[in-house]
């Protein structure tokens, strides 16, 4: 699986999940999130060669097409597969609110 | 929606579905498919600016991150959203077989 367990431990050129730390205030300009100050959102990147974690028949066909026609511009792309939520603390006036934001952290990638 | 109705009628630089005709024999080296000789598989491409057909909260966050930090390499990718099947005819010996291959034709795209 192209997940954090594998990808963070190996120098992998092809499609894999990569670490990306986002500081809410500095990187997004968000002051409203009180805690945490930032988090590992991560992201997916890297080429998608033939049959690498192919998501659909189309991505397999496109991977084969790209392999046999390397001059072509059409190829599958490395995108998130499994995502996890992030719990944040923010304030409405002086009232603290805890919210779980869904699909905030990339745990694995696929070729789509 | 970033679908064929919109994308094929407009010169759109950002994420959109693009026409791609694949000839089974010439492009994939597949002799086994008797009919059709080829089909419009289509593909997705183009940049994913902030909020363009964002798939998840993560892709929205990443789009904002990329907008505010344009030197960053992390950005959402334009990938298939809706796919349709393709019906093919092939032979096993002299016996004709009809098969519906799922997820073969891209009809619309999203930023993931």
């Amino acid at each position: 699986a192209l997940d954090t367990n594998y990808c963070f431990r190996n120098l992998e050129e092809n499609c894999c999940v990569r670490p990306l730390y986002i500081d809410f205030r500095q990187d997004l300009g968000w002051k409203w999130v009180h805690e945490p100050k930032g988090y590992y959102a991560n992201f997916c990147s890297g080429p998608c060669p033939y049959l690498r974690s192919a998501d659909t028949t189309h991505s397999t066909v496109l991977g084969l097409y790209n392999t046999l026609n390397p001059e072509a511009s059409a190829s599958p792309c490395c995108v998130p597969q499994d995502l996890e939520p992030l719990t944040i603390l923010y304030y409405v006036g002086r009232t603290p609110k805890v919210e779980q934001l869904s699909n905030m952290v990339v745990k694995s990638c696929k070729c789509s | 929606a970033l679908d064929t109705n919109y994308c094929f009628r407009n010169l759109e630089e950002n994420c959109c579905v693009r026409p791609l005709y694949i000839d089974f024999r010439q492009d994939l080296g597949w002799k086994w498919v008797h009919e059709p000789k080829g089909y419009y598989a289509n593909f997705c491409s183009g940049p994913c600016p902030y909020l363009r057909s964002a798939d998840t909260t993560h892709s929205t966050v990443l789009g904002l991150y990329n907008t505010l930090n344009p030197e960053a390499s992390a950005s959402p990718c334009c990938v298939p959203q809706d796919l349709e099947p393709l019906t093919i005819l092939y032979y096993v010996g002299r016996t004709p077989k009809v098969e519906q291959l799922s997820n073969m034709v891209v009809k619309s795209c999203k930023c993931s």
Partner: nanobody, 114 residues
Framework: QLQLVESGGGLVQPGESLRLSCAAS????????MAWFRQAPGKQRELVAL???????NYADSVKGRFTISRDNAENTVYLQMTELKFEDTAVYYC????????WGQGTQVTVSS
């Protein structure tokens, strides 16, 4: 039930040759795109060579000119002739068939060592 059975792996010295075989059963072999992948320790599987049913072939840059993929539809077998083997060719080699979906063999170990 589909089966892909690899054979022909072993221990060789640099510069020597090996021929891998993959016998297929339970699929329409003549229609399948056949491929050899390899996986070195701590690495993902990578495509080594593929051959379509129309005999289109493709090779990884690292093996071009040294490896040759071929198929025998009468015998339902795909071969990988490997020459001028190098240390970096050491890996488990997997046979793959794609026909409507992907199928994998169990793998055969190739070790290049002096």
């Amino acid at each position: 039930q589909l089966q892909l059975v690899e054979s022909g792996g072993g221990l060789v010295q640099p510069g020597e040759s090996l021929r891998l075989s993959c016998a297929a059963s339970g699929i329409i072999f003549s229609a399948s795109t056949m491929a050899w992948f390899r996986q070195a320790p701590g690495k993902q599987r990578e495509l080594v060579a593929l051959i379509t049913d129309g005999d289109r072939t493709n090779y990884a840059d690292s093996v071009k000119g040294r490896f040759t993929i071929s198929r025998d539809n009468a015998e339902n077998t795909v071969y990988l002739q490997m020459t001028e083997l190098k240390f970096e060719d050491t890996a488990v080699y997997y046979c793959n068939a794609f026909w409507l979906k992907a199928y994998w063999g169990q793998g055969t170990q190739v070790t290049v060592s002096s």
